[in-house]
């Protein structure tokens, strides 16, 4: 991979340990927590990042679930099990043998159960809605300029192919970014929308995952765009399976 050779660091993931012990003395970086080798030319998977984060825990967060099939990360942080490719394993369990099924972004999509719970496949999150509220400004941002700036950001900072940014909606002060990526659309080497959304979420919170890069400085025609709250909704290719008790709660 293309980790910086001079000082051997991982530009796309500061939660790594790097050393020149790769083939031919090349810089090789491993994620904290899992020890898995990461490709520093692209985003690290959310599963490995969460695992690394749990090796230096911070406060969990809670979000609100808006509708029947849209999932929000209500459960906050947990120490996930990742497969050899760094993806979430379909079934996650905690230390007390409580288990649940997750989607490809690691968000719980079933009721919690015991060790007998089966999660047959990792269900893909194919549609992510990032809902932002920006701080008050003198006037509304120009919609086209705002739209282009956010699309540029996802291309340049997160390396997300432009075809996966489906839409940018704006009704001051609310901005919605829609990311869509079906299993059939995602080619080898494409950044996953779940990973891009996670990096963006951390950037917005001032917790950038990038090494040696400034924090996110969003500007629209030079005007700062300051986000005061973020909600992220996840839609899966197969609807989640929660009991009626939860749905009516």
């Amino acid at each position: 991979h293309t980790a910086a050779q001079d000082n051997c660091t991982c530009p796309t993931n500061k939660m790594t340990v790097c050393s020149p012990d790769g083939p031919g003395g090349r810089c090789q970086c491993r994620a904290l927590g899992s020890g898995m080798a990461v490709d520093c030319s692209t985003l690290t998977s959310k599963c490995l990042l969460l695992k690394a984060r749990m090796s230096a825990p911070k406060n969990a967060r809670t979000l609100v679930r808006p509708s029947e099939h849209a999932l929000v990360d209500n459960d906050g942080l947990y120490d996930p099990d990742c497969d050899p490719e760094g993806r979430f394993k379909a079934r996650q369990c905690n230390q007390t043998s409580v288990c649940w099924c997750v989607n490809s972004v690691g968000v719980r999509r079933t009721d919690k159960g015991d060790l007998s719970l089966r999660c047959d496949e990792l269900v893909r999150t194919h549609h992510i809605l990032i809902d932002l509220r920006h701080r008050p400004t003198a006037g509304a941002f120009n919609h086209s300029d705002l739209d282009a700036e956010l699309r540029r950001l996802f291309r340049e900072r997160y390396r997300l192919h432009p075809k996966f940014v489906a839409a940018v909606h704006y009704e001051q002060p609310t901005i919605q970014i829609e990311l869509r990526q079906n299993t059939s659309q995602k080619a080898a080497g494409d950044v996953d929308i779940g990973d891009a959304a996670y990096y963006f979420e951390r950037d917005i919170k001032g917790e950038s995952l990038f090494q040696g890069r400034g924090g996110l400085d969003l500007r629209v025609r030079g005007e700062p765009l300051q986000v005061e709250r973020t909600l992220i909704y996840y839609l899966d290719e197969i609807p989640p399976k929660f009991s009626m008790k939860r749905l009516t709660a």
Epitope: R151, R155, R159, H161, K163, V168
Partner: antibody
Framework: EVQLVQSGPEVKKPGASVKVSCKAS????????IGWVRQAPGQGLEWIGE????????YYTEKFKGRVTMTADTSTSTAYMELSSLRSEDTAVYYC??????????WGQGTLVTVSS | DIQLTQSPSSLSASVGDRVTITCSAS?????MYWYQQKPGKAPKLLIY???TLASGVPSRFSGSGSGTDFTLTISSLQPEDFATYYC?????????FGQGTKLEIK
């Protein structure tokens, strides 16, 4: 094979408009971005703006805002850049270039626009 | 706008020489891109993400740098390398190019 084929040279009078076309092939047109860059004779490269072909989202640089219009015809996989109120300093080669996770990965061959009275 | 200043503006060198072109940004950028342009032709992507060679680019080309200072190096000049080289950023709108470095045969 990715190709961007631009329209032929144009000679225009000051105050007139010019519309340069860029026909794309070898890739899914609406998945990408087309940027426009110009180069005055003997000078460097100057970015004009870009259009997201799937959504029609456009960004123009401040310098060209109000004078430039970028459009795309998805049925023919062709992008267009129209520049109005032409002046002599607009004489340049105009390039279209495809954007993806790179700003410009493939370029058209260029279209020479000459503005002369 | 982020200004990019290339140095030198022109350079005379011989086949086999090692050549270095620098690009200085007026404020920090994430990555630098480098293009090669030959007379009468469109620019060609040479290096992306500061140091990664574009497809088909010979290994004698290399890129490095971070923040505001970036470098393009040609380890051993070949006859086909005589051209104009441009750096470019897209860390913020508008995308900007350096003024170019013309590499001529001595």
């Amino acid at each position: 094979e990715v190709q961007l084929v631009q329209s032929g040279p144009e000679v225009k009078k000051p105050g007139a408009s010019v519309k340069v076309s860029c026909k794309a092939s070898g890739f899914t047109f609406t998945d990408y971005v087309i940027g426009w860059v110009r180069q005055a004779p003997g000078q460097g490269l100057e970015w004009i703006g870009e259009i997201y072909l799937g959504s029609g989202t456009i960004y123009y640089t401040e310098k060209f805002k109000g004078r430039v219009t970028m459009t795309a015809d998805t049925s023919t996989s062709t992008a267009y850049m129209e520049l109005s109120s032409l002046r002599s300093e607009d004489t340049a080669v105009y390039y279209c270039a495809r954007g993806s996770i790179f700003p410009f990965d493939y370029w058209g061959q260029g279209t020479l626009v000459t503005v002369s009275s | 706008d982020i200004q990019l200043t290339q140095s030198p503006s022109s350079l005379s060198a011989s086949v086999g020489d090692r050549v270095t072109i620098t690009c200085s940004a007026s404020s920090s950028v994430s990555y630098m891109y480098w293009y090669q342009q030959k007379p009468g032709k469109a620019p060609k992507l040479l290096i992306y993400d500061t140091s990664t060679l574009a497809s088909g680019v010979p290994s004698r080309f290399s890129g490095s740098g971070s923040g505001t200072d970036f470098t393009l190096t040609i380890s051993s000049l070949q006859p086909e390398d005589f051209a104009t080289y441009y750096c470019q950023q897209w860390s913020s709108y508008p995308y900007t190019f350096g003024q170019g470095t013309k590499l001529e045969i001595k």
